[in-house]
């Protein structure tokens, strides 16, 4: 709290300029006015303030407005929204894309701080859904973005949102998130023809059912095996040895350095060992010859 | 290409005076608050004056104040800094660096030596 | 502002792990530079709001705290890291820097 001081005789400022560079905490208190301050934000971001500085300006703001600020403040808020708590960003209401662009790019460089978060809830929640165009500027910012957000608030991205995700945006997805985007991806992407469908779902394979793997394996799509080591477990172990083949194509040969580590390990373990030798690998620990497989889940669900 | 380059250093008596250029390129040079920072030989950094985008609002340090003189040319995109009744003590290493929207150096240039001696 | 780094100078390997300290004589938030400067040459911004790596600068490099007390850390030191340090406040007016922490080869 700034003690409340006289405003030294000539000191009043007229506008926000670089005069007030040098003004100390108690001058920039007295001298400078609010209303002036709000109407020329603009300007804040052009005078290199110090922290101190800032903090002096943003109590100004918070004594105009003490409902939050309107969305003509926040748009050029620039290096004092660094100052600003999660509490006071859920006091606004932020509408424009271009706001909440003008924000992330102050932020840039940081990671993604409460505040950052506290403002994309807001303007998520404001828009109702997570459309395209703010999918776009949130990963361009934040290339982690859609794997922090819950497999409930996933749920509201519209399919069509899908084609602004790029592989590096779904790095640090679990598989339940991917549960809820591979469905949507498979909707967006539905109209591509075999090959150029691939490249495109492939970041989203994680999500995948057996059905739809087993259907991949058909259409001579090779693909490699760090995207294979990401599949669910459970939609790979009822794949034979000749779907796995044709869907990992050349790249069959890395399941031998693979052997030891899930979803590859548990495969071997369902797979015959006549059928694994077929392939030449030298994969061991398949089903020994003359052994019978009961699946006692199928058997339950019969039951 | 972004730079500062460093310019009109040397040798110089006791009580003598100096000019020193900074020609800024590759980036808005009348947008940037411009500094002179220098080092003396095996010692730190310090800050020795600033100027304002437009030339008009000031800083020196004390141990300066009186005596350098700071100004800018932005048609030319250049810095300068008068030096008068130069001392001993104000031998170094005098870097310009730039600053944009928080006062820190985001560029330096490579710095142009200061000698003052007899 | 006054702004007091060590150790003054340090050695270390290739490899190590290396941790520089600024204490500032008064809170100044997270309002933190850290720069680089090898011999003969300008120093470069590396870190700035305490925290924020600066573009271009490799990821080894990182830095923390927040009122008086700040680190800057290298991972795992590289050949090209043998330099020295200094921070900057920018909390006030006027801006100052730490004394330096020379690092040197062991």
């Known amino acids: 709290e700034v003690e409340k001081t006289a405003c030294p005789s000539g000191k009043k400022a007229r506008e926000i300029d670089e005069s007030l560079i040098f003004y100390k905490k108690w001058e920039l208190e007295a001298c400078v006015d609010a209303a002036l301050l709000a109407t020329q934000m603009d300007r804040v971001n052009a005078i290199p303030f110090t922290y101190e500085q800032l903090d002096v300006l943003k109590h100004k703001l918070d004594e105009l407005y003490p409902q939050g600020y309107p969305e003509s403040v926040i748009q050029h808020l620039g290096y004092l929204f660094l100052k600003m708590s999660p509490e006071d960003i859920r006091k606004w209401n932020v509408t424009s894309l271009e706001t909440l662009k003008a924000l992330l790019e102050v932020n840039k460089g940081h990671e993604m701080s409460p505040q950052v978060a506290t403002l994309i809830d807001r303007f998520v929640k404001g828009r109702g859904q997570l459309d395209k165009d703010t999918l776009d500027t949130l990963t361009a910012f934040y290339p982690g973005y859609l794997c922090s957000l819950s497999p409930e608030e996933l749920s509201s991205v519209p399919p069509s949102s899908i084609w602004a995700v790029r592989p590096q945006d779904l790095d640090t997805c679990d598989p339940r998130q991917l549960d809820v985007l591979y469905p949507k991806a498979r909707l967006a992407f539905q109209n591509m023809n075999g090959s150029e469908y691939f490249v495109k779902i492939q970041s989203f394979l994680g999500g995948a059912p057996t059905e739809d793997l087993k259907a991949l394996s058909q259409q001579n799509v090779s693909m490699d095996l760090a995207t294979f080591m990401k599949l669910r477990t459970d939609a790979v172990l009822p794949l034979t040895v000749a779907e796995v083949q044709k869907l990992l194509g050349p790249h069959v040969e890395g399941l031998k350095a693979e052997e030891r580590h899930r979803p590859v390990r548990d495969w071997i373990l369902r797979q015959r060992q006549d059928d694994l030798d077929t392939l030449g690998l030298g994969l061991q620990g398949g089903i020994p010859n003359g052994y019978l497989v009961l699946d006692l889940s199928m058997q339950e669900a019969l039951s | 290409q972004v730079q500062l380059v460093e310019s009109g250093g040397g040798l110089v008596k006791p009580g003598g005076s100096l000019r020193l250029s900074c020609a800024a390129s590759?980036?808005?040079?009348?947008?940037?608050?411009m500094s002179w920072i220098r080092q003396a030989p095996g010692k730190g950094l310090e800050w020795v004056s600033y100027?304002?985008?437009?030339?008009?609002?000031?800083y020196y340090a004390d141990s300066v104040k009186g005596r350098f003189t700071i100004s800018r040319d932005n048609a030319k995109n250049s810095l300068y800094l008068q030096m008068n009744s130069l001392r001993a003590e104000d031998t170094a290493v005098y870097y310009c660096a730039s600053i944009l929207s928080v006062p820190y150096f985001d560029l330096w240039g490579r710095g142009t030596l200061v000698t003052v001696s007899s | 502002i006054q702004l007091t780094q060590s150790p003054s100078s340090l050695s270390a390997s290739v490899g190590d792990r290396v941790t520089i300290t600024c204490r500032a004589s008064?809170?100044?938030?997270?309002?933190l530079a850290w720069y680089q400067q090898k011999p003969g040459k300008a120093p470069k911004l590396l870190i700035y709001?305490?925290?924020s790596l600066e573009s271009g600068v490799p990821s080894r490099f990182s830095g923390s705290g927040s009122g008086t007390d700040f680190t800057l850390t290298i991972s795992s030191l590289q050949p090209e890291d043998f330099a020295t340090y200094y921070c900057q406040q920018f909390n006030s007016y006027p801006l100052t820097f730490g004394g330096g922490t020379k690092v040197e080869i062991k």
């Open positions: 709001d305490a925290s």
């Open positions: 008064q809170g100044i938030s997270s309002a």
């Open positions: 100027i304002s985008s437009s030339g008009s609002t000031i």
């Open positions: 590759g980036f808005t040079f009348s947008d940037y608050y």
